[in-house]
């Protein structure tokens, strides 16, 4: 079989700050010099892209400077991280990589993780 | 809404070219690889081409491969099929389509028919 | 390149029937890129189905899909005069994406 796994974390919580951060590794059935990394949002049957970056194997991922994203690329694993969460974002987010270069083209979906993201609760007034 | 349309079609002679056009709007498109797909007539589904993201990365069928040109603008929201060397086999209702972020095929224009005929 | 072969090629059915369409791989493909379309004449083909048995936008409950590795299948329920017309499987993981033969779903 010729199809691309792609292993993500079922579950995730997000820091107080709102901050997520995963492993998303990919089983590669070619050898790819070009690789673009989505991550997407499932919420309900609706499917919205969260970020993109393409990298060339051995440098570094970049993301848009305005990505909530950032990231770094180690041989078949990316370490994601996304951030300015809110409890209003808890949802599945799921990995797709797609090996774009030499031919033929690859499409990988992992199964998402569940991310929680709770807001902090605001600081009490204190009284001294 | 989400849209694709295509133009472009005609009768065209063995050898020749043209260039047929998908205007996409409803969507942000430079986030979307596109595809060309036809359909000769009383034939199935034939895939063709598709070009992903800003364009630098292109795939063909054997059946087009150094007859056929993919590309795209995205600054106009439009994606191309440049057919040079045109045969009778070519004939077919040429469809662009989609590629979700899921990957299926999940918008498609109406179509334009391209028929070369001497 | 992966082949696809679809069974039967026409099916002669009644509204109300079950109808059950066959997609079968020359090698495995992922469930997670297997797709179903509906192509009615002179009518662009719709997505139906995608990643084997997940529904897209706006697709009744009565067709659902199944299946994994080279085996898949799609059945709608009980058949509406509308559910009449040519379906394609499809697979998307890799390059060159290739279709199915289709099967026409006509009235008996």
């Known amino acids: 079989c010729k199809a691309m796994h792609v292993a993500q974390p079922a579950v995730v919580l997000a820091s107080s700050r709102g901050i997520a951060s995963f492993v998303c590794e990919y089983a590669s059935p070619g050898k790819a010099t070009e690789v673009r990394v989505t991550v997407l949002r499932q919420a309900d049957s609706q499917v919205t892209e969260v970020c993109a970056a393409t990298y060339m194997m051995g440098n570094e991922l970049t993301f848009l400077d305005d990505s909530i994203c950032t990231g770094t690329s180690s041989g078949n694993q990316v370490n994601l991280t996304i951030q300015g969460l809110r409890a209003m974002d808890t949802g599945l987010y799921i990995c797709k990589v797609e090996l774009m270069y030499p031919p033929p083209y690859y499409l990988g979906i992992g199964n998402g993780t569940q991310i929680y993201v709770i807001d902090p609760e605001p600081c009490p007034d204190s009284d001294f | 809404q989400v849209q694709l349309v295509e133009s472009g079609g005609g009768v065209v002679q063995p050898g020749r070219s043209l260039r047929l056009s998908c205007a996409a709007s409803?969507?942000?498109?430079?986030?979307?690889?596109m595809h060309w797909v036809r359909q000769a007539p009383g034939k199935g589904l034939e895939w063709v081409a598709v070009?992903?993201?800003?364009?630098?990365?292109?795939h063909y069928a054997d059946s087009v491969k150094g007859r056929f040109t993919i590309s795209r603008d995205n600054s106009k929201n439009t994606l191309y099929l440049q057919m040079n060397s045109l045969r009778a086999e070519d004939t077919a209702v040429y469809y662009c389509?989609?590629?979700?972020?899921?990957?299926?095929?999940?918008?498609w224009g109406q179509g334009t028919m391209v028929t070369v005929s001497s | 390149e992966i082949v696809l072969t679809q069974s039967p090629g026409t099916l002669s059915l009644s509204p109300g029937e079950r109808a059950t369409l066959s997609c079968r791989a020359s090698?495995?493909?992922?469930?997670?890129?297997l797709a179903w379309y509906q192509q009615k004449p002179g009518q662009a083909p719709r997505l139906l189905i995608y990643?084997?048995?997940s529904r897209a936008t706006g697709i009744p409950d009565r067709f659902s899909g199944s299946g994994s590795g080279t085996d898949f299948t799609l059945t709608i329920s009980r058949l509406e005069p509308e559910d009449f017309a040519v379906y394609y499987c499809?697979?998307?993981?890799?390059?060159?994406?290739?279709f199915g033969p289709g099967t026409k779903v006509d009235i008996k």
């Open positions: 409803g969507f942000t498109f430079r986030s979307y690889g």
């Open positions: 070009i992903w993201y800003d364009g630098s990365n292109k």
């Open positions: 389509a989609r590629n979700g972020l899921i990957g299926a095929f999940d918008i």
């Open positions: 090698q495995s493909v992922s469930s997670s890129y």
């Open positions: 499809q697979q998307y993981g890799s390059s060159p994406f290739t």
């Open positions: 990643g084997a048995s």
